[in-house]
């Protein structure tokens, strides 16, 4: 988890396609009860955007503080700020609650750039536009913090989603969606649907904005279109999946593909970018500058600095290509692929342009701890993290941002052979994940 | 060393079009590395971009100005041009001709400069 | 839109004298930012890009320095032939069409 590249902003082997279509898990069969269907009253439960998170309401405490916390699946702990500080307009105050138990230990979470660190508790914890239960939860009370929160996000904690392998101080401390799952009939599955709104938004309009929906113990049909299509999660611990081939405008970067997976590849609800290790990186770029090539664009824009800025209303979406990604399918030999639109991975930016101006980031960047899916990927998909299954589900999000020539796409089956060689095995040592 | 000179009529009627001929020599304008721009000067004023092309012809241009110019580029001339339709006095200026370099964001190199006066 | 804000408008100092001109950008432009010289009657001339490299052929005693909004060009001795009109430019946002108003530095 990289501060400084994490949000909070801290920004293979394929086939061809099988001529007849291979068995493949879809959401036929209800594992659990109230599993699938409509969650009405959890759609459009999330606001912001890309490049500073999308939060979810929480209460925590008795009787109950209403916080904003940033939905993290790259990460395991439940923090909130819990001590004044110049950019949260709130924080939880624990002296105010009736239900809170000190843990009387520490916690410290150092990034790469920043950090914070804080006091570990228990308290009761609901999710006002989630199912309808009351947890009791550990808490990381933040009381100091450095380039962690973002001034004007609207968020004041963190709600890490991924597995306790990663928690910290270590993976004694449950994680939040295990609390909920073993103290209630919540289904051991979350969905996510990640709206990007496709032109930049001032402070009011994101306040105003939807973000999308965190469907908590189900799959709502409503926020997607076609088929899901499911990727093994290959560890518990971040959402790691495995990506056996890449393709920029459906030309195959031809790499190993052990590098895209170098040293893991990750789900990162958490991460704006889609970041890819240092190969990688430098491949697709080269790719993407070729079939991009009757333009020219600044050596710091591909390196995510610089922005480029078209007369509103003429971006050339046309001449971006679109990036695929196949992950490793649920069934022997077979892996389908995801493709994401320059909608997705050019970034519009906010403040800077003007009326007459769209302005955006590439949202495409450089990784020394592997390939993470960040926000960029994500919202072009709803996305089902099925921890009951260990798999995760990809289906084309019925928010996505497209044009009228090309739209997001979940497609398969593919033959794809030896896909268990494109896994990285990490050598176990015992160094912080949080710290490379 | 790579030169640039700007080239045309100093005199222009008003509601004509302005027109410049920018040649390079000591080097390829159909180099990929570069962006070719204009700028321009009013007389006793700050400098005003104007717009830039690509040696493959993709253009960019100043929004101010769009409705009314025109950057094309002729790769076996080593030349680029500049039209600017329906001129007034408030064209007046010192245009120049430039090449954008470094990483394709800064103006590094500039033609001297060529004083276009409009008047009837 | 980026505004740039240059000043003091005009600065008069004498040869020898260290010159500081500041750019302010209406908002962060990172370290993209430019500063040219112009002498009256000739083209503008690169000195420093990308906040505070100096450009090709361009005198130790230019430099650049700053980052997001505040930008600072110093000329640590004045020779007679740095009296000129310097001018400031951002690429945060590209295409590269921001330039600041200007500052003078004449001759006290």
């Known amino acids: 988890t990289q501060h400084g590249i994490r949000l909070p902003l801290r920004s293979g082997l394929g086939g061809a396609p099988l001529g007849l279509r291979l068995p493949r898990e879809t959401d036929e069969e209800p594992e659990e009860p109230g599993r699938r269907g409509s969650f009405v009253e959890m759609v459009d439960n999330l606001r912001g955007k890309s490049g500073q998170g999308y939060y979810v309401e929480m209460t925590v405490g008795s009787p109950p503080q209403t916080l904003n916390i940033l939905v993290d699946t790259g990460s395991s702990n439940f923090a909130v700020g819990a001590a004044p500080h110049p950019f949260l307009h709130r924080y939880y105050q624990r002296q105010l609650s009736s239900t809170y138990r000190d843990l009387r230990k520490g916690v410290y979470v150092p990034y790469t750039q920043g950090k914070w660190e804080g006091e570990l508790g228990t308290d009761l914890v609901s999710i006002p536009h989630g199912p309808n239960v009351t947890v009791r939860a550990n808490i990381a009370a933040i009381t100091e913090s450095d380039k962690f929160f973002i001034n004007g996000s609207n968020w004041e904690g963190i709600l890490g989603l991924a597995y306790a392998e990663i928690a910290r101080p270590d993976d004694s401390l449950e994680p939040f969606f295990d609390s909920l799952v073993k103290q209630t009939h919540v289904p051991n599955l979350f969905s996510l649907q990640l709206c990007g709104a496709g032109f930049p938004l001032n402070q009011s309009e994101v306040l105003a904005s939807v973000g999308g929906s965190m469907i908590i113990g189900g799959i709502d049909h409503s926020l997607y279109t076609g088929s899901l299509w499911y990727t093994p999660i290959r560890r518990e611990w971040y959402y790691e999946v495995i990506i056996v081939r890449v393709e920029i405008n459906g030309q195959d970067l031809k790499m190993d593909c052990k590098e895209y997976n170098y040293d893991k590849s990750i789900v990162d609800s958490g991460t704006t970018n889609l970041r890819l290790p240092k190969k990688v990186f430098e491949a697709a770029v080269k790719s993407i500058k070729a079939a991009s090539s009757t333009e020219k664009f600044p050596d710091g824009f591909w390196l995510g600095e610089q922005l480029v800025c078209w007369q509103a209303g003429t971006t050339p979406w046309n001449i971006f290509p679109v990036i695929s990604l196949y992950l490793m399918g649920e069934v022997t030999n077979q892996s389908f692929r995801i493709t994401i639109l320059p909608q997705q991975y050019l970034r519009p930016v906010e403040d800077v342009a003007t009326s007459q101006d769209d302005c955006y980031k590439f949202a495409i960047s450089q990784s020394s701890t592997g390939t993470v899916m960040g926000a960029v990927i994500m919202e072009g998909f709803y996305v089902v993290f099925d921890r009951a299954r260990k798999r995760i589900g990809f289906a084309v999000s019925a928010c996505h941002v497209h044009d009228e020539f090309r739209t997001a796409a979940v497609e398969g089956p593919f033959v794809t052979l030896d896909m268990e060689d494109c896994g990285y095995n990490i050598p176990q040592t015992d160094e912080s994940t949080l710290m490379t | 060393q790579l030169q640039l000179q700007e080239s045309g009529p100093g005199l222009v009627k008003p509601s004509e079009t302005l027109s410049l001929t920018c040649t390079v020599s000591?080097?390829?304008?159909?180099?990929?590395?570069?962006?070719w721009g204009w700028i321009r000067q009013p007389p006793g004023k700050g400098l005003e971009w104007i717009g830039m092309i690509y040696y493959s012809g993709s253009t960019w241009y100043n929004p101010s100005l769009k409705s009314r110019v025109t950057i094309s580029v002729d790769t076996s001339k080593n030349q680029f041009s500049l039209k600017l339709s329906s001129v007034t006095a408030a064209d007046t200026a010192v245009y120049y001709c430039?090449?954008?370099?470094?990483?394709?964001?800064?103006?590094?190199?500039w033609g001297r400069g060529t004083l276009v006066t409009v008047s009837s | 839109e980026i505004v740039l804000t240059q000043s003091p408008a005009t600065l008069s100092l004498s040869p020898g004298e260290r010159a500081t001109l500041s750019c302010r950008a209406s908002q962060s432009v990172s370290s993209y930012l430019a500063w040219y010289q112009q002498k009256p009657g000739q083209a503008p001339r690169l000195l420093i890009y990308g906040a505070s490299k100096r450009a090709t052929g361009i005198p130790a005693r230019f430099s650049g320095s700053g980052s997001g909004t505040d930008f600072t060009l110093t000329i640590s001795s004045l020779e007679p032939e740095d009296f000129a009109v310097y001018y400031c430019q951002q690429v945060y946002t590209w295409p590269p069409r921001t330039f600041g108003g200007g500052t003078k530095v004449e001759i006290k």
């Open positions: 000591g080097g390829s304008i159909s180099s990929s590395s570069y962006y």
């Open positions: 430039a090449r954008v370099g470094h990483g394709v964001s800064y103006f590094d190199l």
